[in-house]
Interface confidence: medium
């Protein structure tokens, strides 16, 4: 709305940088062939690039990434009893970000 | 995978708490009747609840919210020239979070 401007602070752009995000650990990251198990923890923190850039036709993208293996519990339910196993999930952390030109294909004339 | 366990640290649950997220300011928040304008900045930071809870049938939800009006530029293109106006967008910040029981309807037998 265009009203009640007095109380409003000027909006500040969310700059393009890494921020902490929550990553849901889906079961198919661990085992695509079996659905009869649970994963713990169900979610972890990752660092990801987000935010906006100062001009159009550019997007906030990761310029440096790091793969980070973490150990999770794979909890298989066998005859109503849990069996605990370790599994490794590889997370992707963004270490640095940049505003990168997005190449949009020109229409053929 | 179940391999390469040695190098992996145990995964730590992303606890239910407020984190900084990026909110895209869509044009229809400002004017639903007209598409012939731009908004600046296109995105801002907000505080939002995210993460997982330690037990089943619960979800991370905001327990306290605050509405925060911010001033943005509405840039209308009139006869190929920009006309700058001010507009107010009300953002929702989460101040506190809690793990709240999710009531799942029991199947009727």
């Amino acid at each position: 709305s265009l009203g009640s401007l007095a109380a409003a602070e000027p909006a500040v752009i969310a700059e393009c940088k890494t921020r902490t995000e929550v990553f849901q650990i889906s079961r198919n990251l661990i085992d695509r062939t079996n659905a009869n198990f649970l994963v713990w923890p169900p979610c972890v923190e990752v660092q990801r690039c987000s935010g906006c850039c100062n001009n159009r036709n550019v997007q906030c993208r990761a310029s440096q990434v790091q793969m980070r293996p973490v150990q999770v519990r794979k909890i298989e339910i066998v005859r109503k009893k849990p069996v605990f196993k370790k599994a490794t999930v590889t997370l992707e952390d963004h270490l640095a970000c940049k505003c990168e030109t997005v190449v949009t294909p020109r229409p053929v004339t | 995978s179940l391999g390469s366990l040695a190098a992996a640290e145990p995964a730590v649950i992303a606890e239910c708490k407020t984190r900084t997220e990026v909110f895209q300011i869509s044009r229809n928040l400002i004017d639903r009747t007209n598409a012939n304008f731009l908004v600046w900045p296109p995105c801002v930071e907000v505080q939002r609840c995210s993460g997982c809870c330690n037990n089943r049938n619960v979800q991370c939800r905001a327990s306290q919210v605050q509405m925060r009006p911010v001033q943005v530029r509405k840039i209308e293109i009139v006869r190929k020239k920009p006309v700058f106006k001010k507009a107010t967008v009300t953002l929702e910040d989460h101040l506190a979070c809690k793990c709240e029981t999710v009531v799942t309807p029991r199947p009727v037998t």
């Epitope: 649970l38 009893k81 849990p82 605990f84 370790k86 | 179940l2 366990l5 040695a6 089943r56």
Partner: antibody, heavy 120, light 107 residues
Amino acid sequence: EVQLLESGGGLVQPGGSLRLSCAASGFTFSSYAMSWVRQAPGKGLEWVSYISDDGSLKYYADSVKGRFTISRDNSKNTLYLQMNSLRAEDTAVYYCAKHPYWYGGQLDLWGQGTLVTVSS
Amino acid sequence: SYELTQPPSVSVSPGQTASITCSGDSLGSYFVHWYQQKPGQSPVLVIYDDSNRPSGIPERFSGSNSGNTATLTISGTQAMDEADYYCSAFTHNSDVFGGGTKLTVLG
């Protein structure tokens, strides 16, 4: 204060029965798995039985299977261990213990224990 | 049934490092926890999930687990660390405890 308080121990004859209770306070009992662990005099720890947060998963050590039954009443914040056909080798201090998750995990809180003596 | 094997006793001088081992078949595939028990007291969790320390447990306690062996390490051992230590793992539908190790702090 977060605590677990066992009760119901005592002297019982071989073949007899006892029901142990564990009263939980200071945390949301219904959200966590619980276990019973015992320790015979001068011996090490022996896991006895486990129950998940809602009671849907239960399992037992081979040494007590068919004789002991674990249960919980989440409305009363209480864990139980029904012990039947008791034997001399069941003599031990019985601890109830809390897991940090609904499914289990480590035992992060222990009660003070209650002594069960099986003797004629 | 699955077994966890610990040495019955370990001795260490004050200020030195004590290492207590726990061995079992493919133990590194499971999460190992360590409990401390002092005479007449209930057990206390000192390490969980191989290497994590609960709040309130001193930094001198650490853990590792790979292959067939998990190890509890106490660096700069103090007299107050004298106790029985038990390893534990959840395997094959049951929680298994090691036989326990009596740690003696000499002097």
